[in-house]
Amino acid sequence: KSEMPQPVSIQDINHRVWVLQDQILIAVPRKDRVSPVTISLISCRHVETLEKDRGNPIYLGLNGLNLCLMCAKAGDQPTLQLKEKDIMDLYNQPEPVKSFLFYHSQSGRNSTFESVAFPGWFIAVSSEGGCPLILTQELGKANTTDFGLTMLF
């Protein structure tokens, strides 16, 4: 089990990268002047208490920014949010902090991120560029839920 967050670069199958804009993560085409965020990824240390065969439960943070991705209900719809949080604080907690956890599933070079708190909801980006990251239940339709991960350092 990893005890240090792994820095990764994430892009979708349309080669859009994640960028922080006004405390919101958006997906934009990779260009010269674009500064993609580096994502920190760490496995949950309580993996044995979570569902098996759904993927590797991970916390996702923004490297060096003390911000983590989490899922919370807005009305009756789960939404993706950034919260000020140290990823190692989540990692060290005595129980899985499910609102911040995602099942990371890999198929070939593609990765998906399913909310642990809201099973069936996946991190996605709209097929149009320059849109915020969202949670969706609809796979492979108007939204892209497949991402490519590149390990850094």
């Epitope: 907690q93 005595p94 899985p96 902090v97």
Partner: antibody, heavy 121, light 109 residues
Framework: QVQLVQSGAEVKKPGASVKVSCKAS????????IHWVRQAPGQGLEWIGR????????RYDPKFQGRATITTDTSTSTVYLEFSSLRSEDTAVYYC??????????????WGQGTLVTVSS | QAVVTQEPSLTVSPGGTVTLTCRSS?????????ANWVQEKPGQLFAGLIG???DRAPGVPARFSGSLLGGKAALTLSGAQPEDEADYFC?????????FGGGTKLTVL
Amino acid sequence: QVQLVQSGAEVKKPGASVKVSCKASGFNIKDTYIHWVRQAPGQGLEWIGRIDPAIGTTRYDPKFQGRATITTDTSTSTVYLEFSSLRSEDTAVYYCARLHYFGNNFFFDYWGQGTLVTVSS
Amino acid sequence: QAVVTQEPSLTVSPGGTVTLTCRSSSGAVTTSNYANWVQEKPGQLFAGLIGGTNDRAPGVPARFSGSLLGGKAALTLSGAQPEDEADYFCALWFSNHWVFGGGTKLTVL
């Protein structure tokens, strides 16, 4: 409001089993962890184990592994503790408690009223 | 398995300050033990006071504070009120299970 309501007192013979229930209301049990703790007469609290009601996974104190079984019925928001091979030293008040993540930490914030289990021949 | 020890009883004057401690037989208590404190008033349900060593539960008065003190978890009550007379229990996390202490009976006299 948040409430954990437990089943009534039980008297059991040594070697028997007991099943205590804890019905949750005012919150979604799938969003928290439910723990069982006991207090023998004149003693401190003793942690037995916990369940994640959303998934059904459990953890137990090694001392109670094999004798304690925690289960849940999410359709009725009820968590159960079954305790087997009872001995006189298992006589205690058994409590369910919610362990809830709020802000930055987990809290044992809400507790049931307790269920007295008396083991006597 | 660790044994968690608390003062069996303590007395504080109304308006006074008192510190309850929680010691582990397995060594110094650290933030990794995520100390919790719960209160049991006579005739009432247990109620959570502190989580994660020093985080107050919602609605808990500011006169209750949690900390680490000399290798022990501590609960300090500043400006004790008569209604704070109760039993106080700590719980410490040890990598895959919790251990509760024997409790402290606090008298406000």
